[in-house]
């Protein structure tokens, strides 16, 4: 997260850290007792390592009573996701068991109505991704409020040049932005999950390259079918 600040501890009980061999790789969001939503590209970076999900965390390193690491029973990337595009960049991870819910671990309601968020709406993004262009990684969860950007502006030739489909949304990236390591994390508007940070190798914090988020409402049927 660039241009953000430390999040209130455990105020985002839906927040997950997708880890490989004990190291934070991507963000994720608890959408059901046994399911975490993240980005499909995160799996590519996992290679053959052991994928686990950390829930109930604020600090990645310090002991916290609510923290628990779960093994992954099943990883379900969206069937149309491809390594060379950011289309359909969603991944569902089934935990080895139902998460123990409490004040610091709770699923987040996700948007089912397939309607664009109004431009200018301030949405919350959180993650343990890098906090500087030098690549500094935070130990504690960071967050930032970002305004939603209209698709037409995002698709300008000077911006993402038509790459943003109806199934994606954009947010401003003028010095405040999501960045490497935040992929798979939640974009929360009005207390509801609207988007998931895509995991392309986009430059961060440049206003001409807005943040790209996969619109969860556009994938309601797929999410429901996997969770069923």
């Amino acid at each position: 997260i660039l241009g953000g600040r430390e999040a209130e501890a455990h105020a985002r009980p839906y927040m997950a850290s997708v880890q490989v061999n004990g190291e934070h790789l991507c963000g994720g969001v608890l959408v059901a007792e046994q399911w975490v939503l993240s980005a499909a590209h995160c799996l590519e970076d996992a290679a053959d390592g052991k994928v686990q999900v950390l829930l109930g965390a604020h600090s990645l390193s310090q002991p916290e009573p609510s923290k628990r690491l779960y093994d992954v029973l099943r990883a379900v990337p969206h069937p149309d996701s491809r390594p060379d595009t950011i289309d359909h960049d969603l991944l569902l991870l089934q935990l080895s068991e139902k998460a123990t819910l409490g004040p610091a671990v709770r699923p987040l309601p996700w948007q089912r109505v397939d309607r664009d968020v109004e431009p200018g709406t301030l949405c919350d993004v959180a993650g343990w991704g890098i906090v500087s262009h030098a690549g500094r990684r935070p130990d504690r969860l960071q967050h930032v409020l970002l305004p939603v950007l209209d698709r037409a502006t995002c698709n300008r030739r000077t911006h993402h040049d038509g790459a943003i489909t109806q199934r994606m949304m954009c947010a401003e990236s003028n010095r405040r932005d999501s960045c490497k390591g935040d992929s798979g994390g939640p974009l929360v508007c009005g207390g509801v999950l609207e988007g998931v940070v895509t995991s392309g190798s986009r430059v961060c914090g440049n206003r001409k390259k807005p943040g790209i988020y996969t619109r969860v409402a556009s994938y309601a049927a797929w999410i429901d079918s996997v969770l069923a």
Epitope: E118, R176, G190, V192
Partner: antibody
Framework: EVQLQQSGPELVKPGASVKISCKAS????????MHWVKQSHGNILDWIGY????????SYNQKFKGKATLSVDQSSSTAYMELRSLTSEDSAVYYC??????????????WGTGTRVTVSS | QIVLSQSPAILSASPGEKVTMTCRAS?????MHWYQQKPGSSPKPWIY???NLASGVPTRFSGSGSGTSYSLTISKLEAEDAATYYC?????????FGGGTKLEIK
């Protein structure tokens, strides 16, 4: 203590412009969005828009586009709102407001002292 | 834009009574905020995200609701509760307020 101190009352003529200020103290000014709200005589609250003091990004309620312009001066931790082409409809109390918390459920948790603008010939 | 309608516009009750005011949205919102304002003062945050009391708010206040219908309840009214209460949605730009419920003490 977090405070938003606004400039004093203004009596302006129809057609003129006015610029009101909001000085923030007790927190890091550039960390948080600054919003502006109009309260007209029927005590109706209308959100005007916001500005991000960190990067100047702003968003306006369509109703106030062309009427209000938001700006900031980082060096003095002050936000400004300019209202132009004033009419009697613009007579109201104007508040700056911010959220300086870090939960995902943001709301207007600090309000300015309010600036009364009266438009009269 | 999302329109918020508050009822009643004016509520008159006696100390010790339980009172409830409502806020209806023209389309579904996930959470609602409430503010208290007394004459000559700026609004104060009162209840955020539907049911969480802002700092310093007495526990006799509570908030509830979902979808298009939300309410603020005072379990035992006190004289100091006389004020106007506004609901506000933050689901979508432009952020909108209700017209307010003015609470008067008999």
């Amino acid at each position: 203590e977090v405070q938003l101190q606004q400039s004093g009352p203004e009596l302006v003529k129809p057609g003129a412009s006015v610029k009101i200020s909001c000085k923030a103290s007790g927190y890091s000014f550039t960390d948080y969005y600054m919003h502006w709200v109009k309260q007209s005589h029927g005590n109706i609250l209308d959100w005007i828009g916001y500005i991000d003091p960190y990067n100047g990004v702003s968003s306006y309620n369509q109703k106030f586009k062309g009427k209000a312009t938001l700006s900031v001066d980082q060096s003095s931790s002050t936000a400004y709102m300019e209202l132009r082409s004033l009419t009697s409809e613009d007579s109201a109390v104007y508040y700056c407001s911010s959220y300086y918390g870090s939960s995902p459920y943001w709301y207007f948790d600090v309000w300015g002292t309010g600036t009364r603008v009266t438009v009269s010939s | 834009q999302i329109v918020l309608s508050q009822s009643p516009a004016i509520l008159s009750a006696s100390p010790g009574e339980k009172v409830t005011m409502t806020c209806r949205a023209s389309s579904s919102v996930s959470y609602m905020h409430w503010y208290q304002q007394k004459p000559g003062s700026s609004p104060k945050p009162w209840i955020y995200a539907t049911s969480n009391l802002a700092s310093g708010v007495p526990t006799r206040f509570s908030g509830s609701g979902s979808g298009t219908s939300y309410s603020l309840t005072i379990s035992k009214l006190e004289a100091e509760d006389a004020a106007t209460y506004y609901c506000q949605q933050w689901s979508s730009n432009p952020y909108t307020f209700g017209g307010g419920t003015k609470l008067e003490i008999k």
